[in-house]
Amino acid sequence: EVEKTACPSGKKAREIDESLIFYKKWELEACVDAALLATQMDRVNAIPFTYEQLDVLKHKLDELYPQGYPESVIQHLGYLFLKMSPEDIRKWNVTSLETLKALLEVNKGHEMSPQVATLIDRFVKGRGQLDKDTLDTLTAFYPGYLCSLSPEELSSVPPSSIWAVRPQDLDTCDPRQLDVLYPKARLAFQNMNGSEYFVKIQSFLGGAPTEDLKALSQQNVSMDLATFMKLRTDAVLPLTVAEVQKLLGPHVEGLKAEERHRPVRDWILRQRQDDLDTLGLGLQG
């Protein structure tokens, strides 16, 4: 807490400019009017205030806006966002995607902080759903964002937003999340032709049911082993040897290296030895 002291003569700030960089903490507190700061927030980020000085600027804004900052101020916070607590952010109403982007930029490259998580939560709840532009923005800053959501939260993602998802965005998703995302992806990509469809749907297949895998096996997709290993065990078990062979194409030879791992191990145990022998891989059921 900064002590209240009188502003020295001639030091009262007429505008927010670089002369303030040389003010001590107490001088900033005494000589900068909170209303002036709020109206000239667009200048703050261009001025290289020290990390220490940001505390005073935040204190000023808190006094002026005890119920939470207006978006006109929030959009210009820049590095001041680093000083905000989740409690501060819960008072905000952020509606503009540009404001969201500006604040995420400050934390760019770092893992998600509680402040950022709160900001995103407020923003998405305010919008009512995770639209494509928002998802595009969030996964650009945080590739693992989608997989940090619960299946319930994912259910509000409209199929149109799935176009924004890149394979790496799904790297940390678990089967329950893919169960929710897969039907949305299937719907989103339904008008694509066979090979293009497979490229797009591939990273969502951990949520695919048996009948869809059977259908894919008729389309010469040549699924790689990494994708196959991420399929739901219960979806793989009913597939015949012939269907798996068609599904994997030239990659079928990779089954040998994975014969001790799920879902390959469980699938092998379900097959007749005669059928497995047709693969010529020496798999033992």
């Epitope: 261009a46 290289p48 990390y51 770092h110």
Partner: antibody, heavy 116, light 107 residues
């Protein structure tokens, strides 16, 4: 992809001058702060100077104040360190780095040797 | 100027060990501290810039903690690629200052 590439290092006699360049790509320097940090052989990191190209605001370590000048040409997306009155103790690898507070990207460094 | 004092200045450890490096500021710097890793002949790499948040690509075995004057970088299970020198940096007040470094060597 963000990249910083230093150049201009070399051998110089005490009292001599050198101008180091830091060419940035993958971002525009006027939206960032650019720093020069040096490392004497076998020693730790020492901050030397900083510039905020958007405003031209500069800062210097006491050890180089009055001898070194940091500048930036935003049209070339390049920062510079003009080093005058060089001393033996200025011998170091000089790195340029980017970032308002922490430094998230660094160049590969350029060696400056001050010796007679 | 704010002095940053790291300890130890060097340590020997084995792969799999838990390693802790501390950094003490000569005055309160709140949470304005970053951590870097530097390997011989290479530029430093940012590990942690904001509070205790890892920078992208930094393995989760690294973690940072502390505020005020005492800060810690921990490697939960040392890997061969972690043998390097580690630096803390305060950016709370000008001039920004670095610790003298902690060299982590193979035992």
């Amino acid at each position: 992809e963000v990249q910083l590439v230093e150049s201009g290092g070399g051998l110089v006699q005490p009292g001599g001058s050198l101008r180091l360049s830091c060419a940035a790509s993958g971002f525009t320097i006027d939206k960032e702060a650019i720093h020069w940090v040096r490392q004497a052989p076998g020693k730790g990191l020492e901050w030397v100077a900083s510039i905020y190209p958007h405003s031209g605001f500069t800062l210097y370590a006491d050890s180089v104040k009055g001898r070194f000048t940091i500048s930036a040409d935003t049209s070339k997306n390049t920062a510079y360190l003009q080093m005058n009155s060089l001393r033996a103790e200025d011998t170091a690898v000089y790195y340029c780095a980017r970032g308002r507070y922490w430094m998230d990207y660094w160049g590969q460094g350029t060696l400056v040797t001050v010796s007679s | 100027d704010i002095q940053m004092t790291q300890s130890p200045s060097s340590l020997s450890a084995s792969v799999g060990d838990r390693v802790t490096i501390t950094c003490r500021a000569s005055q309160d710097v709140e949470d304005g501290v970053a951590w870097y890793q530097q390997k011989p002949g290479k530029a430093p790499k940012l590990l942690i810039g904001i509070k205790d948040l890892l920078y992208s690509g930094v393995p989760s075995r690294f973690s940072g903690s502390g505020s005020g004057t005492d800060f810690t970088l921990t490697i939960s299970s040392l890997q061969p690629e972690d043998f390097a020198t580690y630096y803390c940096q305060q950016y709370y007040r000008w001039p920004s200052t670095f610790g003298q470094g902690t060299k982590v060597e193979i035992k």
